[in-house]
């Protein structure tokens, strides 16, 4: 029974997007009154795991020594205090990469773009997939865009961006996936360096913020119109 206790905070280290075989630690932080922590995984019997709190009792560690498909999914945690169980944490989406072969990422018409113009990043897979994702390295939200064709199997996805500004310059990678599990991604594509040159007009000095300003993706070339799950996944359903 969820009580009036404040919800805990749930996060993953080193992050929520983990390569196959790598280790990951899930942390749940509650209050100093916590006596026990529980981790639930969506579509798995509850509780998925229980842990005693680490001193000073305000958090617990759930360890995954080697990432596999079984661990990918959506998690929530709770803590128990003398007055009962807390509300659930916001969800954590743990994503595994390396489930499929890597796609190819290219830029049309060219990876060299003039500010104020457009570019389309094209992610192509060898086998048909129904979901493609584009990420920008060192962006505030590492997974910027998720695209689904409502089950239609495609060999490629186009990510249009316009107007491009200096903020869009940087390194991009893409992933592909199947709709039945958005938590299992391909190996990442080789990196694509997008270079924004010149300007149609002198822009003001760029701020330090990343492209993840949405997409779609919203965008902000990739600005999503959907929600931003706790993992930092930004989903944009086309």
């Amino acid at each position: 029974q969820a009580g009036p206790l404040p919800k805990p905070t749930l996060w993953a280290e080193p992050g929520s997007v983990i390569s196959w075989g790598n280790s990951v630690t899930i942390w749940c932080q509650g209050t100093l009154e916590a006596r026990e922590y529980r981790l639930d995984k969506e579509e798995s019997p509850a509780p998925w795991d229980r842990q005693n709190p680490l001193e000073p009792k305000n958090k617990a560690r759930f360890s995954i020594p080697s990432m596999t498909e079984d661990y990918a999914g959506r998690y929530r945690c709770y803590y128990r205090s003398p007055v009962g169980w807390s509300q659930p944490s916001d969800p954590l989406e743990l994503v595994m990469t390396g489930a499929y072969s890597k796609p190819t990422l290219s830029a049309l018409p060219s990876p060299l773009v003039t500010s104020g113009k457009s570019v389309t990043l094209l992610c192509q897979s060898r086998s048909p997939m129904d979901t493609f994702l584009l990420i920008k390295e060192r962006a505030a939200h590492p997974l910027l865009h998720l695209r689904s064709e409502h089950g239609a199997q495609q060999h490629q996805a186009e990510f249009p961006m316009s107007p491009v500004t200096s903020v869009h310059g940087g390194t991009y990678r893409c992933f592909s996936s199947h709709g039945f599990s958005h938590y299992l991604l391909s190996h990442p594509s080789d990196p694509l360096e997008l270079i924004v040159s010149g300007s149609l007009e002198d822009p003001r000095p760029s701020p330090t913020r990343s492209v993840s300003t949405a997409a779609g993706p919203e965008d902000q070339p990739l600005m999503p119109t959907g929600s931003v799950p706790h993992s930092g996944l930004r989903r944009h359903w086309e």
Epitope: P160, V167, P207, R209, A215, G216, P217, E218, D219
Partner: antibody, heavy 118, light 107 residues
Framework: EVQLVESGGGLVKPGGSLKLSCAAS????????MHWVRQAPEKGLEWVAY????????YYADTVKGRFTISRDNAKNTLFLQMTSLRSEDTAMYYC???????????WGQGTSVTVSS | DVQMTQTTSSLSASLGDRVTISCRAS??????LNWYQQKPDGTVTLLIY???RLHSGVPSRFSGSGSGTDYSLTISNLDQEDIATYFC?????????FGGGTKLEIK
């Protein structure tokens, strides 16, 4: 629900100034680039200005460059268009619109009317 | 600047008809072509972006196609509420430019 509400339009003499505002709600304003678009009476749509989400980049149509200034206050979820040295050809309905980052304007306000006449 | 041309300024059709509105760009715009609907009260709505992608909430009777310089908007089963003016717009390079509009009327 995304909502954009323009205000500040009115009647102004040639050479005069006017400041339009656009109040945004229903989305994280600071995440999106914004546009001003205008439509003269019985005419088509004309793009006026664009401001990137963090105000880092701004573009203007040649017809307004040097006279109009687009700005935004992300803390107040508001977009502005400062118009100076107004001419009769600036008479139009002015719309603010949200940039979708893919070359389109995905949500528009209802517009505010500006009339420049002596 | 990229010039956008909608050769048909007005179009008359019957309810239930399949209607196609064309738009031509003065240069290749790499599919960065969008369609908007403006109702008689002035309300503007995005229908299609990036040539063929349907904006959320737009009925599936609207579709878009094209490439290079030639693009079109198709309304497959004309409804009374589709009476409006339709504008194309290129988002390939600033300044963004619009076509002159096509006013759709009922026969």
């Amino acid at each position: 629900e995304v909502q954009l509400v323009e205000s500040g339009g009115g009647l102004v003499k040639p050479g005069g100034s006017l400041k339009l505002s656009c109040a945004a709600s229903g989305f994280t304003f600071s995440d999106y680039g914004m546009h001003w678009v205008r439509q003269a009476p019985e005419k088509g749509l004309e793009w006026v200005a664009y401001i990137f989400s963090g105000s880092s980049t701004i573009y203007y149509a040649d017809t307004v460059k040097g006279r109009f200034t687009i700005s935004r206050d992300n803390a107040k979820n508001t977009l502005f268009l400062q118009m100076t040295s107004l001419r009769s050809e600036d008479t139009a309905m002015y719309y603010c619109a949200r940039a979708d980052g893919r070359g389109a304007m995905d949500y528009w306000g209802q517009g505010t009317s500006v009339t420049v006449s002596s | 600047d990229v010039q956008m041309t909608q050769t048909t300024s007005s179009l008359s059709a019957s309810l239930g008809d399949r209607v196609t509105i064309s738009c031509r760009a003065s240069q290749d715009i790499s599919k960065f072509l969008n369609w908007y609907q403006q109702k008689p009260d002035g309300t503007v709505t995005l229908l299609i972006y990036y040539t063929s992608r349907l904006h959320s909430g737009v009925p599936s009777r609207f579709s878009g196609s094209g490439s290079g310089t030639d693009y079109s908007l198709t309304i497959s089963n004309l409804d009374q509420e589709d009476i409006a003016t339709y504008f194309c717009q290129q988002g390939n390079t600033l300044p963004w430019t619009f076509g002159g509009g096509t006013k759709l009327e009922i026969k």
